[in-house]
């Protein structure tokens, strides 16, 4: 049975959440991946997704969310810049594999964003206030609209289990435009 576990990230407004979803299996490398928010009692909502097929080391930006898939490591990097208090919530990464239901990546992220000066980065957080320059070319997001009823949650149980590979998610308002972004160093 699948155990739904969470990993908590506590950050300040203006900071950047920078997490990785471990999709483990090579067969998922080219699969389209999505970042979803889970609100109690509702279907998970897709906020951003990679292209289909998912390209290696090819950043996609949707608003303040940046997704980058690293096939060589089996990891999807998810960044959310300029965090706001309203971004607080529960998130998950999934792999789209139609016609089957999305495959969930382990674990969920419980993001808590608080007001206050971001200060110096600690060993367990990234408080860099990066400003990403966005090129003018944009395309429409092509995220699948379906969500499996089996992924609907009542308030998911809060877990303190420290599990090996965090996954990642975040919140934003306008998810219509996907923007290709150069690699940031």
């Amino acid at each position: 049975a699948t155990k739904l576990t969470e990993e908590k990230y506590e950050l300040k407004e203006g900071q950047t959440l920078d997490v990785k979803c471990d999709y483990t299996l090579e067969k998922f490398a080219s699969s389209q991946k999505a970042w979803q928010i889970i609100r109690d009692g509702e279907m998970p909502k897709t906020l951003a997704c990679t292209e289909r097929p998912s390209k290696n080391s090819h950043p996609v930006q949707v608003g303040r969310i940046i997704l980058e898939d690293y096939h060589d490591h089996g990891l999807l990097r998810v960044r959310m810049v300029n965090l706001q208090v309203e971004d607080s919530g529960l998130y998950q990464c999934v792999i789209y594999q139609p016609p089957k239901e999305p495959h969930m990546l382990f674990d969920r992220i419980r993001l808590v964003v608080t007001k206050g000066f971001s200060g110096t980065p600690g060993s367990n957080e990234n408080s860099t206030q990066n400003v990403y320059k966005i090129p003018p070319t944009t395309t429409k997001a092509l995220c699948p609209l379906y969500t499996s009823p089996r992924t609907v949650t009542q308030a998911p149980p809060k877990s303190t289990a420290d599990v090996s590979t965090p996954d990642s998610e975040i919140n934003l308002t306008n998810v219509t435009d996907i923007i290709r972004v150069p690699v940031f160093n």
Partner: antibody, heavy 117, light 111 residues
């Protein structure tokens, strides 16, 4: 070509400190996790911990938590293992590794740490 | 923490023979439809090499004679026909829970 090179191994007295380095080439450590694993002479493998260099988030084996600290400098593409209050039982070859398939891959050649008076 | 127990401790075989190594976990290492159980090979004086990840998937450049199976708590590494370079120590390792843990190893030696 992906390569990890550990350095900093030395002979150190019990109670002493040491910092090991893990220099990566052929990939950006921002894009993966870096793990540290050790192997005492003639013994098995023991996972020490890992870091997500991009976010700085770390995880440790409880046996070393508080004494060992993993960090990374992404501008140098290098991860570090700071070891304090060293004990004789910390004598081992220390490896850094990259990440693949949900676990550790891309291993360095290892660096020997000897803790002895 | 999850304890991994490997058996046998030593396996004495000849080249061309089939090797079957076992790894048992103290609790399930399955989640999200994946078994987070991996196998490594280590030769003297060398770093370990990832052979099998997620119980059944071969690592990069690993020959087809290596295969993995199992789920939950019981796992097997099979080498269909031993080559001279396969004589080494094999470790299972779980990446389901922190701390990641390794088995004590199985030495495959020439008979």
């Amino acid at each position: 070509e992906v390569q990890l090179v550990e350095s900093g191994g030395a002979l150190v007295k019990p109670g002493g400190s040491l910092r090991l380095s893990c220099a990566a080439s052929g990939f950006n450590i921002d894009n993966t996790y870096i793990h540290w694993v050790r192997q005492a002479p003639g013994k098995g493998l023991e996972w020490i911990g890992r870091i997500d260099p991009a976010g700085g988030r770390t995880k440790y084996d409880p046996k070393v938590k508080g004494r060992f600290t993993i960090s990374a400098d992404t501008s140098k593409n290098t991860a570090y293992l700071q070891m304090n209050s060293l004990k004789t039982e910390d004598t081992a070859v220390y490896y850094c590794t990259g990440h693949y398939g949900g676990t550790m891959d891309y291993w360095g050649q290892g660096t020997l740490v000897t803790v002895s008076s | 923490e999850i304890v991994l127990t490997q058996s046998p401790a030593t396996l004495s075989l000849s080249p061309g023979e089939r090797a079957t190594l076992s790894c048992r976990a103290s609790e399930s290492v399955d989640n999200y439809g994946i078994s987070f159980l991996n196998w490594y090979q280590q030769k003297p004086g060398q770093a370990p090499r990832l052979l099998i990840y997620a119980a059944e998937y071969r690592g990069r450049g690993i020959p087809a004679r290596f295969s993995g199976s199992g789920s939950g708590t019981d796992f097997t590494l099979t080498i269909s026909s031993l080559e001279p370079e396969d004589f080494a120590v094999y470790y299972c390792q779980q990446s389901r829970h922190v701390p990641y843990t390794f088995g004590q190893g199985t030495k495959v030696e020439i008979k």
